[in-house]
Amino acid sequence: SPIMNLEQSPLEEDMSLFGDVFSEQDGVDFNTLLQSMKDEFLKTLNLSDIPTQDSAKVDPPEYMLELYNKFATDRTSMPSANIIRSFKNEDLFSQPVSFNGLRKYPLLFNVSIPHHEEVIMAELRLYTLVQRDRMIYDGVDRKITIFEVLESKGDNEGERNMLVLVSGEIYGTNSEWETFDVTDAIRRWQKSGSSTHQLEVHIESKHDEAEDASSGRLEIDTSAQNKHNPLLIVFSDDQSSDKERKEELNEMISHEQLPELDNLGLDSFSSGPGEEALLQMRSNIIYDSTARIRRNAKGNYCKRTPLYIDFKEIGWDSWIIAPPGYEAYECRGVCNYPLAEHLTPTKHAIIQALVHLKNSQKASKACCVPTKLEPISILYLDKGVVTYKFKYEGMAVSECGCR
């Protein structure tokens, strides 16, 4: 159990963040640490707690699993939006109403899209059930209209006032999924205060005749316990992203100097040889002078090491549908002065490492931590909504550094 190994890992000096936590706080156990990590993780997902339902009972829409698998297996393809949510029809009691060749299907969706997200696209997926005489080659030709049902206030209590979202024709030869663009309505819903919204689907014969069994039937599958329940798929993007400026850091690295090197006549090189050569010269001097650092530097300098996270192992398979686990990596090792350029040290880390070198009692070493994180794709439950994130940021270490 890879992540559980942390509990038993030897608490060597500067081995890892966990080592520091355990050595400095004797009372902390692994479960407490795991809980605090979980809380932080949930906070970033805007979740207050892990959904209580067991993943075994959650039957995500096939479409969402197909989406996840498509982008997980084909790394060259990208979805049209970073976040994809699926909302299922919540109206499990209303029956379709048939009248003069017109069949009406009321649909109800609990849709909640955060205001900071931009809705790129939304589609209503309906499974059409086609019944026709197999001896007749023709398919079933029907007119379909999808309405947004408005909240009625005042004059028309009880009336269903509706706006036309989509109007078109379906020519059905086989039962299959049909997709309709309802982006305008979902953008409207996002702006509105309420989360419960209604659509209504009308299917009617094209030529004013009552539906005739001989010409076949076309219906929408709205059965609750069914894989074919109407689905609302909302594609959105998170608009908030921050990028750090690095000019000051680079400047600090270029000015990095050991006071002990002053009397060795190395000052004159600061504007002479390149940065790498200077780093190498300083490194040689330090390695020669400090056996302990030389020993550590061989195999235990700050670097990325494998760490596979199994969601089942940490109890998160109850809300993370896919993947079952992933390679997160971790940063292990020591940050000794001088801090190499590839470890992209901060000004503070450089100073702290220097102070530690002079007086180990006064300051601890800089920490070996992730400095660049990569996203992973996840399919998870958010308040009962099956949600896919193509890029769930900050999940896997791509680079380690000293901080």
Epitope: L150, K153, G154, D155, N156, E159, N161, L163, S167
Partner: antibody, heavy 115, light 111 residues
């Protein structure tokens, strides 16, 4: 194709009743909604009321006591009836189709209220 | 009941950019849906913008709509103004109370 055509009198006596019909083609009144909007000469647009696809009707409260909107789906017609007309009711009266937004208008009928 | 306030007239030169405003007197402009209509002299209106910032098919992308909650206003921006853009522009608000309110209209003159 989609069309809306207003018909009715050009001239109405003060205190009399205005009766205008909007005949539509190319769409169904049980699918689309119809607005009535008027525009006095040289002035702005004023929403009067809406005949909803579900059969509901909304009125501008400024007209509610004297305005009645109805429809006959078999004839594809929406009617507007307004009584107690005054000279300031002189305007061009439009019907317009509301789908997700107003996408088609009639050409309007100019009604003059004068004795 | 609120009102939608538009300036009576504006003039601009061909090729320039103009921004027409529509201020909601009370209540929040963001709580309703804003439409913009163009009406040429003697003609029926046509919808240029719906839901504040959506363009119906056939409307040139020179026309764009926006909402500014700080000024409680909606805006219709016309880039690269053409002679044929000379018309009266009306804003309209539609809220979930199923009520439609028009602004007084802005007459745009293209010099």
């Amino acid at each position: 194709q989609v069309q809306l055509q207003e018909s009715g009198p050009d001239l109405v006596q003060p205190s009399q009743t205005l009766d205008i019909t909007c005949t539509v083609s190319g769409f169904s009144l049980t699918t689309y909604n119809v607005h009535w909007v008027r525009q006095p000469p040289g002035k702005g647009l004023e929403w009067m009321g809406t005949m909803w696809n579900g059969g509901g009707i909304d009125y501008n409260s400024a007209f509610k006591d004297r305005l009645a909107i109805s429809r006959d789906t078999s004839k594809n017609q929406v009617s507007l009836k307004m009584d107690s007309l005054q000279t300031d009711d002189t305007a061009k009266y439009f019907c317009a189709r509301l789908g997700y937004y107003v996408d088609y208008w009639g050409q309007g009928i100019l009604v003059t209220v004068s004795s | 009941q609120f009102a939608l306030i538009q300036s009576d007239s504006m003039s601009t030169s061909a090729g320039s950019t103009v921004k027409l405003s529509c201020k909601r007197s009370t209540g929040n402009i963001g709580s309703s849906y804003v439409y913009w209509y163009q009406q040429h002299e003697g003609r029926s209106p046509t919808t240029m913008i719906y839901d504040g910032d959506k363009r119906p098919d056939g409307v040139p992308d020179r026309f764009s709509g926006s909402i500014d909650s700080s000024s409680n206003s909606a805006f219709l921006t016309i880039n690269d103004v053409q002679i044929e853009d000379e018309a009266v522009y009306f804003c309209q608000s539609f809220s979930s109370g199923i009520k439609f309110i028009f602004g007084g209209g802005t007459k745009l003159t293209v010099l």
